[in-house]
């Protein structure tokens, strides 16, 4: 018969013959021959291969370096890599999450629109008219100005995006 030029799924072509690929979690030890099957061995501890493959070495699991603010989100298996995320208060600098930076704080005059997660930074927004923030915070939203009227008081000092209004007693007109 004619030697094959292409092989079935989960096979590979070597020296005009089709050999079985190794399943995920296993590495290639030796190619098949006309008499013997492909031989594969499981990846070792802290190693993985996530596809049908003919790799002779497994990949090392990612190391979540605590010195870079990383921690393990999901432990790797023989078929999957370790997934890292950042410690509380930090977020990844990239999708691969190779290092972390502190969550950004929203300056006075800005409030938190969206609190940071392990993978996304804090999203800030300017405090609109009627709202203020007088602190630098990664959690605080803009607060509404105090309503002097509901306290039967009057505005003595107007609020800004960084300060609350100052309320005071109403001036009584004397007869």
């Amino acid at each position: 018969p004619e030697p094959p030029t292409a092989c079935r799924e989960k096979q590979y072509l070597i020296n005009s013959q089709c050999c079985s690929l190794c399943q995920p979690g296993q590495k290639l030890v030796s190619d098949c021959t006309e008499f013997t099957e492909t031989e594969c061995l499981p990846c070792g501890e802290s190693e993985f291969l996530d596809t049908w493959n003919r790799e002779t070495h497994c990949h090392q699991h990612k190391y979540c370096d605590p010195n870079l603010g990383l921690r393990v989100q999901q432990k790797g298996t023989s078929e999957t890599d370790t997934i890292c995320t950042c410690e509380e208060g930090w977020h990844c600098t990239s999708e691969a999450c190779e290092s972390c930076v502190l969550h950004r704080s929203c300056s006075p005059g800005f409030g938190v629109k969206q609190i940071a997660t392990g993978v996304s930074d804090t999203i800030c927004e300017p405090c609109p008219v009627g709202f203020f923030s007088n602190v630098s915070s990664a959690f605080e939203k803009c607060h509404p100005w105090t309503s002097c009227e509901t306290k039967d008081l009057v505005v003595q000092q107007a609020g800004t995006n960084k300060t609350d209004v100052v309320c005071g007693p109403q001036d009584r007109l004397r007869a």
Partner: nanobody
């Protein structure tokens, strides 16, 4: 340099047993499939048996099934062929072979097995 050195051949009576050895050197023995082939006087090369790198996969020619056993000791870089219930038609020069990239590419010098009464 790859070297394959067969030993254990000799004269044996029909029904007898022999154990052939193949000492390998010059390559990482436990990374390659190995095999035995034979050539009887005036005949072509016949594959007898083969074994995967870790011994997980074996092959036997129909003519030797149930009588011959292939094995390997990767710690000693040695391939074996245990031959029982030998017959006159097993008389041949037996060659040890190493596979690479799916083909048997290195051969030993051979050891002669003679089965005769």
């Amino acid at each position: 340099e790859v070297q394959l050195l067969e030993s254990g051949g000799g004269l044996v009576q029909p029904g007898g047993s022999l154990r052939l050895s193949c000492a390998a050197s010059g390559f990482t023995f436990d990374s390659y499939a190995m095999g035995w082939a034979r050539q009887a006087p005036g005949k072509g090369l016949e594959w007898v048996s083969a074994i995967g790198a870790k011994g997980l996969s074996t092959y036997y020619a129909d003519s030797v099934k149930g009588r011959f056993t292939i094995s390997r000791d990767n710690s000693k870089n040695t391939l074996y062929l245990q031959m029982n219930s030998l017959r006159a038609e097993d008389t041949a020069v037996y060659y040890c072979a190493k596979a690479a990239r799916g083909k048997f590419d290195y051969w030993g010098q051979g050891t002669l097995v003679t089965v005769s009464s």
